[in-house]
């Protein structure tokens, strides 16, 4: 697995360099997670033909994956920093159960899956420090998450691969939208 941001040899070798600002650290963290997702998607796509599935087929699913909408204030039109930040944190918290599901889904990229999960937890902490209105952030119910996880793990092999593919694709899209929005803050 790649080295998490802030732990690479360049940082160690250059103590005179300006420390990263909060925004730079968040930016770097998201890009690191996106790299991890790319590696996981590569294994998924090599293993099955899920990646050729049409958008229509993927839309017909029973999952409730977080998605950016106009009302969330993260797009250029109607941008609202506070609303958007709440949406990003809430969405990441909702993705956590799906990232847990991914943990036993990879053979050669097992460490990478763990790195994506742990790095997302760190990203949430970074963003929570940045947020002013933490009360507006709803944390998913652990009981609901536990039964969702059980349900996902109960699926047949094809559905598990399809679910894995969809989680990775949706998480990638969510992070890319978050990255664009955070760069405006």
């Amino acid at each position: 697995a790649p080295v998490p941001p802030g732990e690479d040899s360049k940082d160690v070798a250059a103590p005179h360099r300006q420390p990263l600002t909060s925004s730079e650290r968040i930016d770097k963290q998201i890009r690191y997670i996106l790299d991890g997702i790319s590696a996981l998607r590569k294994e998924t796509c090599n293993k099955s033909n899920m990646c050729e599935s049409s958008k229509e087929a993927l839309a017909e699913n029973n999952l409730n994956l977080p998605k950016m909408a106009e009302k969330d204030g993260c797009f250029q039109s109607g941008f609202n920093e506070e609303t958007c930040l709440v949406k990003i944190i809430t969405g990441l918290l909702e993705f956590e159960v799906y990232l847990e599901y991914l943990q036993n889904r990879f053979e050669s990229s097992e460490e990478q899956a763990r790195a994506v999960q742990m790095s997302t937890k760190v990203l949430i902490q970074f963003l929570q420090k940045k947020a002013k209105n933490l009360d507006a952030i709803t944390t998913p119910d652990p009981t609901t998450n536990a039964s969702l996880l059980t349900k996902l793990q109960a699926q047949n092999q094809w559905l598990q691969d399809m679910t894995t593919h969809l989680i990775l694709r949706s998480f990638k899209e969510f992070l890319q939208s978050s990255l664009r929005a955070l760069r405006q803050m």
Partner: antibody, heavy 120, light 111 residues
């Protein structure tokens, strides 16, 4: 030819143990989840246990009625799946089938079955 | 658990006519546009044989007299025209998620 062949059935007393075996041939065994399904006149067809792949850490799942008493295992080197049955009850009586689900979940291959009778 | 209710429990149909067996699931068995409902035929002393998978796809070597339909929670198996060889027990099974569950079965006889 894709084939599953069960063995190990017979008569056992309540509270006793028995181990069923299933020999698989004609397909890449290590790529498939494997299951045991049983059938009795009283309960009809009833799924019993499942074992997944090495990449899934050989995850196992059981029907509520057998959990804690039955153990499913596999040996990919010799293409065998097993069902260890302990603390057997009269209601465990039936024909036990070894089945292979295809990738989409359908049980497309079944063995001929082995009969288990639990009686004193 | 997904409960499958099959009806009727037994059915007598004349040769050459249509036999229809229904199966209702306690919750939806479809996802990503596929219905994970399968149909099996079982004759005495034999294991179940796959007839239909994913609600409407014909199993290998199964004659076209057999067809399956339905989505969501309601499914049916049709046999037309009925032949002598079709006398058997028929079961539906959901293959969406474990515990993998079966219907109670339908005994098909010739009238």
């Amino acid at each position: 030819e894709v084939k599953l062949e069960e063995s190990g059935g017979g008569l056992v007393q309540p509270g006793g143990s028995m181990k069923l075996s299933c020999a698989a041939s004609g397909f890449t065994f290590s790529n498939y989840w494997m299951n045991w399904v049983r059938q009795s006149p009283e309960k009809g067809l009833e799924w019993v246990a499942e074992i997944r792949l090495r990449s899934n850490k050989y995850a196992t799942h059981y029907a509520e009625s057998v959990r804690g008493r039955f153990t499913i295992s596999r040996d990919d080197s010799i293409n065998y799946v097993y069902l260890q049955m302990n603390n057997l009850r009269a209601e465990d009586t039936g024909i036990y089938y070894c089945t292979r689900p295809r990738y989409e979940g359908t049980f497309d291959v079944w063995g001929a079955g082995t009969t288990v009778t639990v009686s004193s | 658990d997904i409960v499958l209710t099959q009806s009727p429990a037994s059915l007598a149909v004349s040769l050459g006519q249509r036999a229809t067996i229904s199966c209702r699931a306690s919750e939806r068995v479809d996802s990503f546009g596929i219905s994970f409902m399968d149909w099996f035929q079982q004759k005495p002393g034999q294991p179940p044989k796959l007839l239909i998978y994913a609600a409407s796809n014909l199993g290998s070597g199964v004659p076209a007299r057999f067809s399956g339909s339905g989505s969501g929670t309601d499914f049916s198996l049709n046999i037309h025209p009925l032949e002598e060889d079709d006398v058997a027990m028929y079961f539906c099974q959901q293959s969406k998620e474990f515990p993998w569950t079966f219907g109670g079965g339908t005994k098909l006889e010739i009238k």
